[in-house]
Interface confidence: low
């Protein structure tokens, strides 16, 4: 018969596993099996026989099973024996990588690679690699005879660098029992390297400065280098040395700072492996408050006005105010203080207010004083121009330029100009100490001419206080000159004529030159010499004239400068009528008597009177004086018909009478033949 074993001759078993060794026969129906170790030590297993097979089960395998096991099969009288060498090992887990601490760039670190429960160690090899680089390899040959499960380690110390980030540490353990392929003889552990950098180069930037004023603000920004990026923590050092946490942000902003905010501020950059701090000292200084006085360091105030002086404080929350004059005279004003402003109202401003006023501000234990000079002036109205009379060409006139209620007088200048020409200038330099409102005048006399008309007479008053700010510093009044010219060259135009027929119309136009344009006045001279005003129109029109309209008419040109007149005689002619032809003393006289033959035309002036004596041989024109013909010592031949013709441009009228001359001798009348 034959004997066979499974496995055939060698079994590699891992401690703790269950191992079965099988022994079987062929060619023997009822074999008898027995198992023993080569050195007759305990089997440390359980045998089960079944027919032609015997199984030795060792569960679990331990060091007590590391023997050469012999199976003996007895078939009747024959014995067969076959051995199986049981070898044990232990390699149950992957290695473990341990770091002595976090990987900090630049700081040495120990890497420990441990392989637990290994047997046999003399077959163990551990390799430690960083990336592809073998850092260390170790075999454990020294303790070959010890039968125990042990943890074997390999340690390497190295200094990480930034470039190690992302690399892997590989711990590879090999148990050199690889005669049989089925046993995993290599185990490994992998660890990715995370290299840290402890915070360093912590920097604080302070804006605007570490020296600050009360009420100001500061922004402090902190940065720190490290891996991972450090977290930033701001704290303040308290008097007892403790830190008071302020913020977990890189930027710390402190606003409306007070003096108690002075101190040391700490910025700490913190990451997993360390911290780094930087300190900065902030000094909050008491804010230098400022005082402003308005309207300015000096103010020009017009007497009678209301003036408000304002004292304003910046940089002090609750100031106290006081006002005084530089010479500690009464304030003569009303003070009102509220918050950071105080006002002193002087109303109305008078001479007693001409001082330097001081505003004293107290803030805490500090005092500040600001002054304002109140300078007075009075220059309320424009100058007044007055003249002694109207301006008449060639006649002198006195111009007065009056500036009312002026102060200070010593700064006043008055100037009189005609057009661009300065006529007079005066400065009032005296009276410097007088504190009163005065009226000041400039007077001058000049002779106006026609050419001055239309020119401006300017009175300019200047108050020379340029160092005071007020408007106006200059006032002026202007008067346009109109120089009067007395009427002259007065003329009358009569249309159609000054001699007219009764019933016709006449226009009499009067022209007179002067400035201002003369007013025209038409009058008629009455027989008693008085003037009867007729019209103020330049043209006097008479319609349907009558003889009574005849007479002397006067045209008068009148203006402020004088008057000028022109006379015109108007003659209204009518056809002669009411002719009277008389003989005086009678129409019948004696020879030798004196006879006056008189012809009158009572209603018509300007007629020609023609006296004639009619005769057969022809008429004789008699020389008459004013229509009267005197026959001295009448003769008989003087008897006859006398004719009077009253004649003018318009017409004529005849009258006749018969003169009878009686002879003295025979008392006969003599009649001239008709």
């Amino acid at each position: 018969f034959k004997i066979e074993t499974t496995p055939e001759s060698r079994y590699l078993a891992q401690i703790g596993d269950s191992v079965s060794l099988t022994c079987s026969t062929t060619g023997c129906e009822s074999p008898f099996f027995s198992w023993r170790t080569q050195i007759d030590s305990p089997l440390n297993g359980k045998v089960t026989n079944e027919g032609t097979t015997s199984t030795l089960t060792m569960n679990p395998v331990s060091f007590g099973n590391e023997h050469s096991y012999l199976c003996t099969a007895t078939c009747e009288s024959r014995k067969l024996e076959k051995g199986i060498q049981v070898e044990i090992y232990s390699f149950p887990k992957d290695p473990e990588i341990h770091l002595s601490g976090p990987l900090e760039a630049g700081k040495p670190i120990t890497v420990k690679c441990s392989v637990a429960d290994v047997y046999p160690f003399d077959r163990l090899e551990i390799d430690l690699l960083k990336g592809d680089h073998l850092m260390k390899s170790q075999e454990f040959l020294e303790d070959a005879d010890r039968k125990s499960l042990e943890t074997k380690s390999l340690e390497v110390t190295f200094t990480p660098v930034i470039e190690d980030i992302g690399k892997v540490l590989v711990c590879r353990a090999k148990l050199h029992i690889d005669e049989m392929d089925s046993v995993p003889t290599v185990r490994q552990a992998v660890k990715e390297l995370q290299v840290y950098i402890s915070p360093k180069n912590t920097v604080i930037s302070v804006n605007p400065s570490t020296k600050l004023q009360e009420g100001g603000s500061v922004t402090m920004t902190c940065s720190s280098e490290g891996l991972p990026a450090p977290e930033i923590f701001w704290s303040k050092k308290l008097d007892n040395g403790n830190l008071q946490h302020l913020s977990g942000n890189a930027t710390l902003t402190l606003i409306a700072m007070r003096m108690e905010d002075s101190g040391i501020y700490v910025c700490e950059g913190v990451n997993l492996i360390g911290k780094n701090r930087k300190e900065v000292e902030l000094i909050v200084q008491e804010k230098p408050f400022t005082v402003e006085i308005s309207p300015g360091p000096r103010i020009a105030a017009q007497i009678g006005d209301s003036v408000m002086l304002t004292c304003s404080v910046m940089g002090c929350e609750s100031p106290s105010f006081s006002w005084r004059t530089q010479i500690d005279s009464p304030l003569s004003g009303k003070v009102r203080s509220e918050g950071t402003n105080s006002t002193l109202t002087l109303s109305p401003v008078s001479f007693e207010n001409e001082h330097s006023y001081l505003c004293t501000v107290t803030c805490g234990h500090k005092k500040l004083e600001k002054g304002i000079q109140v300078e007075l002036y009075s220059f309320p109205r424009d100058p007044e121009i007055e003249m002694s009379g109207g301006l008449v060409n060639g006649s002198s006139v006195t111009v007065s330029c009056k500036v009312p209620s002026v102060y200070p007088l010593d700064r006043l200048e008055i100037e009189l100009l005609k057009g661009e020409t300065i006529l007079e200038n005066i400065e009032f330099l005296e009276d410097t100490d007088m504190k009163s409102l005065e009226n000041k005048s400039l007077e001058m006399t000049f002779i106006p001419t026609i050419e001055d008309t239309g020119k401006a007479l300017v009175c300019q008053a200047k108050l020379h206080i340029d160092d005071m700010e007020f408007e106006p510093k200059q006032r002026q009044s202007t008067q346009t000159l109109y120089v009067n010219v007395a009427p002259r060259d007065t003329t009358v135009l009569v249309s159609p004529s000054s001699i007219l027929e009764e019933g016709s119309s006449v226009n009499m136009t009067c022209l007179s030159q002067g400035f201002p344009a003369p007013k025209i006045l038409w009058s008629r001279q009455l027989p008693n010499g008085e003037l009867q005003p007729l019209s103020e129109n330049a043209t006097l029109t008479l319609i349907s004239t009558k003889m009574e309209d005849s007479g002397v008419y006067l045209c008068e040109g009148i203006n402020q400068a004088g008057r000028s007149r022109k006379e015109v005689e108007l003659i209204i002619q009518v056809t002669p009528k009411d002719i009277k032809l008389t003989a005086f003393p009678s129409e019948s006289v004696k020879e030798g008597d004196t006879v006056i033959i008189s012809c009158t035309c009572g209603n018509v002036p300007e007629t020609w009177i023609i006296l004639k004596k009619k005769a057969e041989t022809g008429d004789t024109v008699l020389k008459s004086i004013d229509g009267a013909y005197t026959i001295r010592k009448a003769q008989l031949k003087d008897a006859g018909v006398y004719e009077c013709e009253s004649k003018n441009k318009v017409g004529s009228q005849l009258r006749s009478l018969t003169l009878d001359v009686q002879g003295r001798e025979n008392n006969k009348d003599y009649f001239s033949p008709e």
Partner: nanobody
Framework: QVQLQESGGGSVQAGGSLRLSCTAS????????MSWVRQAPGKGLEWVSG????????YYADSVKGRFTISRDNAKNTLYLQMNSLKSEDTALYYC??????????????????KGQGTQVTVSS
């Protein structure tokens, strides 16, 4: 205008508890760090506790660490301070205060800060 109204103060025996509340209005509460500060009789303002905008970071003075808890409810615009194991030295007027922005604690040392009228906490032994 920033308005803060504290409530929840009162008198309590040493070892007892109180919960203070502060209701905020007039500003975007959820954008500001918030603090609790207190003023003991005759003393200056003392910073007690602070919380960041979303409540993820809280900070405490050493004197209250482990006893007080700060929290906030941005939906209700409310800040809380849970005070446990109260001691007589916790007696003070408690104010809630806001910083000037999301990165600032202006009330860290009792300097300027918008704060409410305060709520009185009295702890008797």
């Amino acid at each position: 205008q920033v308005q803060l109204q504290e409530s929840g103060g009162g008198s309590v025996q040493a070892g007892g508890s109180l919960r203070l509340s502060c209701t905020a209005s007039g500003f975007t509460y959820s954008s500001y760090y918030m603090s609790w500060v207190r003023q003991a009789p005759g003393k200056g303002l003392e910073w007690v506790s602070g919380i960041n905008v979303d409540g993820s970071n809280t900070y405490y003075a050493d004197s209250v660490k482990g006893r007080f808890t700060i929290s906030r409810d941005n939906a209700k615009n409310t800040l809380y301070l849970q005070m446990n194991s109260l001691k007589s030295e916790d007696t003070a007027l408690y104010y809630c205060a806001t910083g000037s922005g999301r990165d600032s604690y202006d009330c860290y040392s009792g300097s300027w800060c918008p704060k409410g009228q305060g709520t009185q906490v009295t702890v008797s032994s």
